[in-house]
């Protein structure tokens, strides 16, 4: 989701935005700081073993509107939050995993009778 009621239409920022990056640092990052013309993000998702993994970093303006929309993906629990209001704003983003649905239990590795 986007924070602070930002509009969904991506508009070019007049200046570069610095974001914290973790597990998602591009080659041009330095000291776990990346730069972007788009958004900072923090995302939580389950890995293959069902363990929650938090990643953060930069999303370029191109395509970031779609990526920040947090559209549900079948059979995948994940949540993303995006921000632009200040440098390293994603330090303060704490997305949570969406609740398990009944069918997630059925389709998952553990079956409840």
């Amino acid at each position: 989701k986007k924070e602070d009621g930002e509009s969904t239409a991506p508009t070019a920022r007049p200046k570069v935005l610095r974001c914290k990056c973790h597990h998602h640092c591009p080659e041009d990052s330095v000291n776990n700081i990346c730069s972007t013309d788009g958004y900072c993000f923090t995302m939580i998702e389950e890995d293959d073993s069902g363990t929650p993994v938090v990643t953060s970093g930069c999303l370029g303006l191109e395509g970031s509107d779609f990526q920040c929309r947090d559209t549900p993906i079948p059979h995948q629990r994940r949540s993303i939050e995006c921000c632009t209001e200040r440098n390293e704003c994603n330090k303060d983003l704490h997305p949570t995993l969406p609740p398990l649905k009944d069918r997630d239990f059925v389709d998952g590795p553990i079956h409840h009778k």
Epitope: P14, K15, R18, D28, S35, E62, R86
Partner: antibody, heavy 116, light 112 residues
Framework: QVQLQQPGADLVKPGTSVKLSCKAS????????MQWVKQRPGQGLEWIGE????????MYNQKFKGKATLTVDTSSSTAYMQLSSLTSEDSAVYYC?????????WGQGTTLTVSS | DVVMTQTPLSLPVSLGDQASISCRSS???????????LHWYLQKAGQSPKLLIY???NRFSGVPDRFSGSGSGTDFTLKISRVEAEDLGVYFC?????????FGSGTKLEIK
Amino acid sequence: QVQLQQPGADLVKPGTSVKLSCKASGYTFTSYWMQWVKQRPGQGLEWIGEIDPSDTYTMYNQKFKGKATLTVDTSSSTAYMQLSSLTSEDSAVYYCARFGYYVDYWGQGTTLTVSS
Amino acid sequence: DVVMTQTPLSLPVSLGDQASISCRSSQSLVHSTGNTYLHWYLQKAGQSPKLLIYKVSNRFSGVPDRFSGSGSGTDFTLKISRVEAEDLGVYFCSQSTHVPFTFGSGTKLEIK
């Protein structure tokens, strides 16, 4: 029009500190980063660091960490760079420059002379 | 740090000639956003640098169309199609893809 006003020159003694100023006008001060660049004769241009006036977030060239401190006063649209423990190596022209994704406007530069 | 190597160091030209300046970077300047942050500046004697070209090939406002920039990755060129007296000075390339931002050592354009 965009203007970045810097004092023309400053003469200081070795071991002291100096605070250089850069007054911005003609644009929204908080909408762009302010960078500082050092130029010594025959040594080219060196990027010192930058500050985002909207949140005072700074990034420094590792080489100038501990030497330069960048600050802003948004009420007067002025950026400052303090240089400490000055030596003759700090004698140079110092430019402030407006930065979005590239520097588009430069100040006229302050010639700093460190001499006893 | 990314090293920016400019050639030649000095470029003697006759007025009306074409001039070409090369700038090579020690790393690719393609940013993770897909942009290439390579820029060209002209510094005349006793003045501050002035922006000519930003992001490889975009002329800054008020810059004559005799100035053009090209290149990609690590290899970039500034061309002046017909040199005029007001073009004399030192040309710098600069990158703002990688922190710390770095500059070329400069190319002095002078009259033959």
